[in-house]
């Protein structure tokens, strides 16, 4: 059977202290439904960055609407990057379960590093 | 009016190399799924590949490591670059704009690519 | 992939007469699936969407049902302008897939 794939086409990104980062995901399927997450790191310790269901996250924009039912782009741009945000960003599927969604599958993650600011 | 227009088709040898250009108006391609699909002559509907609005790509089997879809937003338009060509890549290729991915809701008028000796 | 089967892959029909094709999909799609019309030398054209929606400007005699695996496509009352190739398409999974084909002739 088929079955959702995460691409997240970029190994790494660099990006200059002060700058957005675009940090690209990209599902291969609308099933299953569910919500996506974006976290820096992995594990049980990994920084939620981006939550498609609730939350603020002021310096996060989406390149997709993604209250649109068949979006399939994931992508988003943090804004204002500074060195404490380097690290590894995954973009993570989950599946809608009751009471709580289930993570379904994560993308292969994106390493981003912080260039000093140009003087 | 929303519009587009392919052109870049023609003949070319097996082995060959062509680039399809797609010049939309009325909306901009860079907030929109854009895929291309192609239909052999007498054949049915096969779509080859998709640019999502976040630049991620995605590829038929059939063309994979041989076709790159790209686009230019300065100048709205899609691009197919055609590689390593086929016999079996004759057909006439068509750019779409997707509805988020899955309606297929404005076509092009088709541009045709034969591959031939 | 996805394999959508379409049937019949060809029909006559007079004007007038009520028009049915089904498709039918290799897994669950829910009701990720789209209907076409293609005329001779011409792009395809969206008729329905997610199965039962119908396309602006599209007349009311085209419908679409189904979910899950099997899909119906109904002209209601055949008109001239209709005589076509229609086809199926599932959007719930890369890459695309078409059906294909049924075209509908003049008995």
């Known amino acids: 059977e088929d079955e959702l794939q995460v691409i997240q086409p970029e190994k790494s990104v660099s990006v200059a202290a002060g700058e957005s980062a675009t940090l690209r995901c990209a599902m291969t399927s609308l099933i299953p439904v569910g919500p996506i997450m974006w976290f820096r790191g992995a594990g049980a310790g990994r920084e939620l960055i981006y939550n498609q269901k609730e939350g603020h996250f002021p310096r996060v924009t989406t390149v997709s609407e993604l209250t649109k039912r068949n979006n399939l782009d994931f992508s988003i741009s943090i804004s204002n990057i500074t060195p404490a945000d380097a690290g590894t960003y995954y973009c993570v599927k989950f599946r809608k379960g009751s009471p709580d969604d289930v993570e379904f599958k994560s993308g292969a993650g994106t390493e981003l590093s912080v260039r000093a600011k140009p003087s | 009016e929303v519009q587009l227009v392919e052109s870049g088709g023609g003949l070319v040898q097996p082995g060959g190399s062509l680039r399809l250009s797609c010049a939309a108006s009325?909306?901009?391609?860079?907030?929109?799924?854009m895929s291309w699909v192609r239909q052999a002559p007498g054949k049915g509907l096969e779509w080859v590949s998709v640019?999502?609005?976040?630049?991620?790509?995605y590829y038929a089997d059939s063309v994979k490591g041989r076709f790159t879809i790209s686009r230019d937003n300065s100048k709205n338009t899609l691009y197919l670059q055609m590689n390593s060509l086929r016999a079996e890549d004759t057909a006439v290729y068509y750019c779409?704009?997707?509805?988020?991915?899955?309606?297929?809701?404005?076509w092009g008028q088709g541009t045709m690519v034969t591959v031939s000796s | 992939d996805i394999q959508m089967t379409q049937s019949p892959s060809s029909l006559s029909a007079s004007v007038g007469d009520r028009v049915t094709i089904t498709c039918q999909a290799s897994?669950?799609?829910?009701?990720?699936l789209n209907w076409y019309q293609q005329k001779p030398g011409k792009a395809p054209k969206l008729l329905i969407y997610?199965?039962?929606n119908l396309e602006t400007g599209v007349p009311s005699r085209f419908s679409g049902s189904g979910s899950g695996t099997d899909f119906t496509f109904t002209i209601s009352s055949l008109q001239p302008e209709d005589i076509a190739t229609y086809y199926c398409?599932?959007?719930?999974?890369?890459?695309?897939?078409f059906g294909g084909g049924t075209k509908v002739e003049n008995q």
């Open positions: 779409a704009r997707g509805q988020y991915t899955g309606s297929l809701d404005v």
């Open positions: 897994q669950d799609i829910s009701n990720y």
């Open positions: 640019i999502y609005s976040g630049g991620s790509t």
């Open positions: 009325g909306f901009t391609v860079s907030s929109n799924y």
């Open positions: 398409q599932q959007f719930a999974f890369l890459p695309l897939t």
């Open positions: 997610d199965a039962s």
